[in-house]
């Protein structure tokens, strides 16, 4: 069969039906990321709370992130939301402190449960906080007598009862 003449048009061009199906370059502010396209797509514009992370080219779309104080949400940074503090998560009512037993070490995302050291047979070396996960120490069996000058770690706790520095809560 006859080959489609448009299949010869590379990325960055489009098959121009108005000009005998010759390959025309994508106009400014548009792109085609694959060959054989009959139209070029309009470049994404990173405006308002969005910031240009990667400029649009004739073969690839622009990529956006967020202006200072905001961070991306959704595939391809479809939304920007305000940063919270470490130790918080964003809810419908604004930024809220992480509940006891959970932490968030970033300005975005949700609070996650502390690691349960006892599940790995380890003890808690450093208590968890709203901003930091617990640090698990070696299992009691790993500590041979006199082998360490470190104060022995606290015994493992039941899930949900890890020690926590609750100052300021």
């Amino acid at each position: 069969g006859l080959q489609d003449p448009c299949s010869n048009c590379p990325a960055g061009t489009f098959c121009d039906n108005n000009r005998n199906q010759i390959c025309s370059p994508c106009p400014p502010n548009s792109f085609s990321s694959a060959g054989g396209q009959r139209t070029c797509d309009i470049c994404r514009q990173c405006k308002g709370v969005f910031r240009t992370r990667k400029e649009c080219s004739s073969t690839s779309n622009a990529e956006c992130d967020c202006t200072p104080g905001f961070h991306c949400l959704g595939a391809g940074c479809s939304m920007c939301e305000q940063d919270c503090k470490q130790g918080q998560e964003l809810t419908k009512k604004g930024c809220k402190d992480c509940c006891f037993g959970t932490f968030n070490d970033q300005k975005r995302g949700i609070c996650r449960p502390w690691t349960n050291c006892s599940l790995d047979g380890k003890s808690v070396l450093v208590n968890g906080t709203k901003e930091r996960d617990v640090v698990c120490g070696p299992s009691p069996a790993d500590l041979s007598p006199g082998a360490s000058s470190v104060t022995p770690p606290a015994p493992a706790r039941e899930p949900g009862h890890s020690p926590q520095d609750i100052e300021g809560r």
């Epitope: 308002g48 240009t52 200072p68 503090k85 009512k93 604004g94």
Partner: antibody, heavy 118, light 107 residues
């Protein structure tokens, strides 16, 4: 309607700490950030820092070691503290709201003049 | 820090004139530029953000354009109440920085 009002002492001695309050109304503190900007007499605008709705702060590195911004949601108030002031800190100090659409200032207080002098 | 250089530093125009203020960023800031108007003895007022979007309530005679490093604020027909100093501001990265200002006088 949206309103912001700065208040605090108009005169501060060198080496002391400048403390200002911004009292706001007409918008929710859980949704909007607030910036502090200053303007020395006859000069341009300088951004000092911002406190976001969740309480996270970002400061101008040129002042970072001296500036602290905080808020008291229950009083609808924001505060600016600038330590170890000199005559170069004499300026009109403004607080301004950050909208949800960009990292800019859409509503400003009327400003308060702070003079640093002994 | 990103430097924002405004020109001219001052200009004089008659009522009805078309006036253009330019702002040049020391590095690419996309379209993350705002413009403010400050009337004598008053606080600044937002005019434009995202280089070209008018803030609510801003008269249509004010327009903004540009991207990358070069930006323009245009007043299509100057009015007596436009007597003010105009500032650009970049918000592409911290610290947020302002231009030095352009003082508009009315002849």
């Amino acid at each position: 309607q949206v309103q912001l009002q700065e208040s605090g002492p108009g005169l501060v001695k060198p080496s002391e700490t400048l403390s200002l309050t911004c009292t706001v109304s007409g918008f929710s503190l859980i949704s909007y950030g607030v910036h502090w900007v200053r303007q020395p007499p006859g000069k341009g605008l300088e951004w000092l820092g911002v406190i976001w709705s969740g309480g996270s702060t970002d400061y101008n590195p040129s002042l970072k070691s001296r500036v602290t911004i905080s808020k008291d949601t229950s009083k609808n108030q924001f505060s600016l503290k600038l330590s170890s002031v000199t005559a170069a800190d004499t300026a009109v100090y403004y607080c301004a709201r950050n909208p949800l659409t960009a990292t800019v200032m859409d509503y400003w207080g009327q400003g308060t003049l702070v003079t640093v002098s002994s | 820090d990103i430097q924002m250089t405004q020109s001219p530093s001052s200009l004089s125009a008659s009522v009805g004139d078309r006036v253009t203020v330019t702002c040049r960023a020391s590095q690419n800031v996309g379209t993350n530029v705002a413009w403010y108007q400050q009337k004598p003895g008053k606080a600044p007022k937002a005019l434009i953000y995202s280089a070209s979007y008018r803030d609510s309530g801003v008269p249509s005679r004010f327009s903004g354009s540009g991207s990358g490093t070069d930006f323009t604020l245009t007043i299509s027909s100057v009015q007596p109440e436009d007597l003010a100093t105009y500032y650009c501001q970049q918000y592409n990265s911290y610290p947020l920085t302002f231009g030095g200002g352009t003082k508009l006088e009315i002849k």
